[in-house]
């Protein structure tokens, strides 16, 4: 799976739209990082 | 809204180092990072690297390692690249990008800056 | 480093057209690739992410396909304000990178 700086961005990106925004205040892709997926 | 604001054009002697700035409005500065794409007069475009503004920690294209550096000031919202011992192929126009989640999900790049390199 | 080969390297269309451009990874790349547009003298505009979506704003006629190693750029009905370059990156390993672009004419 793709763990670059603009994956991890991307993907993070999808998991707030289908969670409707709802998710804590530091789930940011430089927060998240790699690591995380 | 969210704008990269970038510093103007330089003219640099080889061998000698650039440093450009990228000021960035409108979103959470930290939560996002921040790429550096170059482009020289009539070639494709090429990417120098990336840093996470949050904690510091960069990414180079191996091409660039050991002459570019990425930073950031966190508290002015401004990432940096320097790029040292320039060449004359090193002229182009240098760019910083970054894809924001919030506001607005887009991939937003700065104005660009114009590096020429000249004896 | 993975190279992105862009075909053609120019096209002259007509307004109206369909244009269809190509990108070939030289490996996997998964669905990670973008195209921007870039007209003279300014910044790249980014189209399309993770092969086929729109970014917000992105006119419908803009249009993204593939996986691996084959992507396309398709514009369904060419505009006058779409005449300028085209490129296709890889975001799926370091170090990203570009195609060689486009140059979509006017005939």
């Known amino acids: 799976s793709c763990n670059t700086a603009t994956c991890v961005t991307h993907r993070l990106a999808g998991l707030l739209s289908r969670s409707g925004g709802v998710v804590k205040d530091n789930f940011v892709p430089t927060n998240v990082g790699s690591e995380a997926f | 809204e969210v704008q990269l604001v970038q510093s103007g054009a330089e003219v640099k002697k080889p061998g000698a180092s650039v440093k450009v700035s990228c000021k960035a409005s409108g979103y959470t500065f930290t939560d996002y990072y921040m790429n550096w794409v170059r482009q020289a007069p009539g070639q494709r475009l090429e990417w120098i690297g990336d840093?996470?503004?949050?904690?510091?920690?960069?990414t180079y294209n191996q091409k660039f390692k050991g002459r570019a550096t990425l930073t950031v000031d966190k508290s002015a919202s401004t990432a940096y690249m320097e790029l040292s011992s320039l060449r004359s192929e090193d002229t182009a126009v240098y760019y910083c990008a970054s894809i924001i989640i919030v506001p607005d999900y887009f991939d937003y790049w700065g104005q660009g800056t114009t590096v020429t390199v000249s004896s | 480093d993975i190279q992105m080969t862009q075909s053609p390297s120019s096209v002259s269309a007509s307004v109206g057209d369909r244009v269809t451009i190509t990108c070939k990874a030289s490996q996997n790349v998964g669905s990670n690739v973008a195209w921007y547009q870039q007209k003279p003298g300014k910044s790249p505009k980014a189209l399309i992410y993770s092969a086929s979506y729109r970014y917000s704003g992105v006119p419908s006629r803009f249009s993204g396909s593939g996986s691996g190693t084959d992507f396309t750029l398709t514009i369904s009905s060419l505009q006058p304000e779409d005449f300028a370059t085209y490129y296709c990156?890889?975001?799926?390993?370091?170090?990203?990178?570009f195609g060689g672009g486009t140059k979509v004419e006017i005939k």
């Open positions: 990156q890889q975001y799926n390993s370091y170090p990203y990178t």
């Open positions: 840093i996470n503004p949050n904690s510091g920690v960069t």
